[in-house]
């Protein structure tokens, strides 16, 4: 089990994967993407309380220093640990193309 | 040059590398680290305004969605893009050992 997977703030409130619906207009993609018309963006959202899903030693240090110097050092932040590929059908000069993006959808989250 | 390296909030206010001095006591390391007595921790601190040092497409999406749904989607966060190794002299059962940690000091920062 990963370091600190229990959320002390209540279920669903700590750093985890979350799906956010977005239209092509929301993303500013309407002029170059044909499909999908809406995107399910998986992203990392939630608080990073002490040692919750700490990514590495740097994250552990950050937690300690945030406790001591909260005005200077921010708390660790919930960010993607890895990504899932996403396929878009794009408009091109000659027609359309199927394009895969490897850094668009979060797959797993941690605190850093 | 990296995407969006100009800080619109004023010099030094956006995501960048900072050095924070910390004692072994601050870090809770006093019982297992002999040297150094103080650590110069390099960490990533600062705001991530629109497209500033965006790490990838996910970060760009996050910026767009934060603008639309600020209660749900946080702004991108300033985190290490890479690390520098750090050597600690540790206490062991038999004496001391020299240990290198690869994920302790931030080397470079980006927004994600």
């Amino acid at each position: 089990a990963r370091n600190g997977d229990h959320c002390p703030l209540g279920p669903g409130r700590c750093c985890r994967l979350h799906t956010v619906r977005a239209s092509l207009e929301d993303l500013g993609w309407a002029d170059w993407v044909l499909s999908p018309r809406e995107v399910q963006v998986t992203m990392c959202i939630g608080a990073c309380p002490s040692q919750f899903r700490a990514a590495n030693m740097h994250a552990q240090i950050k937690t300690s220093l945030h406790r001591l110097k909260p005005d200077t050092v921010p708390a660790p932040c919930c960010v993607p640990a890895s990504y899932n590929p996403m396929v878009l059908i794009q408009k091109t000069d000659t027609g359309v193309s199927l394009q895969t993006y490897d850094d668009l959808l979060a797959k797993d989250c941690h605190c850093i | 040059a990296r995407n969006g390296d100009h800080c619109p909030l004023g010099p030094g206010r956006c995501c960048r590398l900072h050095t924070v001095r910390a004692s072994l006591e601050d870090l809770g390391w006093a019982d297992w680290v002999l040297s150094p007595r103080e650590v110069q921790v390099t960490m990533c601190i600062g705001a991530c305004p629109s497209q500033f040092r965006a790490a990838n497409m996910h970060a760009q999406i996050k910026t767009s969605l934060h603008r639309l749904k600020p209660d749900t989607v946080p702004a991108p966060c300033c985190v290490p893009a890479s690390y520098n190794p750090m050597v600690l002299i540790q206490k062991t059962d038999t004496g001391v050992s020299l240990q290198t940690y690869d994920d302790l000091l931030a080397k470079d920062c980006h927004c994600i």
Epitope: G10, P11, G12, R13, R16, L17, H18, T19, V20, R21, S23, S35, P36, R37, E38, Q40, T42, I45, N84, P85, M86, V87, L88, I89, L98, T100, L105 | K69, D71, T72
Partner: antibody, heavy 114, light 110 residues
Framework: QSVKESGGRLVTPGTPLTLTCKAS????????MSWVRQAPGKGLEWIGT??????GTWYASWVKGRFTISKTSTTVDLKMTSLTTEDTATYFC??????????WGPGTLVTVSS | DIVLTQTAASVSEPVGGTVTIKCQAS??????LAWYQQKPGQPPKLLIY???DLASGVPSRFKGSGYGTEFTLTISGVQCGDAATYYC????????????FGGGTEVVVK
């Protein structure tokens, strides 16, 4: 744009069965697709979801490996094993879950009986 | 998986009245909630997505509200054609949540 399920039939307990969902008017490769079931006179029950772009899957905890969602270039399939009478239901294919224009198929009936 | 609880299994309201259906999530899901209407023999029809956004073609008397763990579907000026079963669904695809449905609330119009 529409989806249609097929493959539902009467089977005996323990018989494996595969249901197929075919999409019309849109490219499966860019959408999330789900399977949902509804036992006679009961509520809706989410089975699982696949992102056809990557093949990534999510399942309800009760599935416990008995059902598998997979994709081909033109279909999304639901493979079911170790069927029991409790699995008797109408099975729906859905373009979703989280689209403002979620599309549901008419459903296909699976009856498990000895 | 997340649990969605629809407190009332059935509600009855005269034509023109207001129906309120509640849905409570066992964990914090922000605005990741949809509401569906289902009539006998038909697949469900999407009414509300993202907790409060009205799906295309749905009359404005249907209103979704809520955020986090508490959600509500309100039907104002209820009509005979609104008699159906209403389900909430978590639309978050995280590993801990899943796209669970609530147990459903039957609306009877008198």
């Amino acid at each position: 744009q529409s989806v249609k399920e097929s493959g539902g039939r009467l089977v005996t307990p323990g018989t494996p069965l595969t249901l197929t969902c075919k999409a019309s008017g849109f490219s499966l490769s860019t959408y999330w697709m789900s399977w949902v079931r509804q036992a006679p006179g009961k509520g809706l029950e989410w089975i699982g979801t696949i992102y056809a772009g990557s093949g990534g899957t999510w399942y309800a905890s009760w599935v416990k490996g008995r059902f598998t969602i997979s994709k081909t270039s033109t279909t999304v399939d639901l493979k079911m094993t170790s069927l029991t009478t409790e699995d008797t239901a109408t099975y729906f294919c859905v373009r979703g879950p989280n689209y403002s224009d979620a599309i549901w198929g008419p459903g296909t009936l699976v009856t498990v009986s000895s | 998986d997340i649990v969605l609880t629809q407190t009332a299994a059935s509600v009855s309201e005269p034509v023109g009245g207001t129906v309120t259906i509640k849905c409570q999530a066992s964990e914090y899901i922000y605005s990741s909630l949809a509401w569906y209407q289902q009539k006998p023999g038909q697949p469900p029809k999407l009414l509300i997505y993202d907790a409060s956004d009205l799906a295309s073609g749905v009359p404005s008397r249907f209103k979704g509200s809520g955020y986090g763990t508490e959600f509500t579907l309100t039907i104002s000026g209820v009509q005979c054609g609104d008699a159906a079963t209403y389900y909430c669904q978590c639309t978050d695809l995280s590993s801990s949540a899943g796209n669970t449905f609530g147990g459903g609330t039957e609306v009877v119009v008198k």
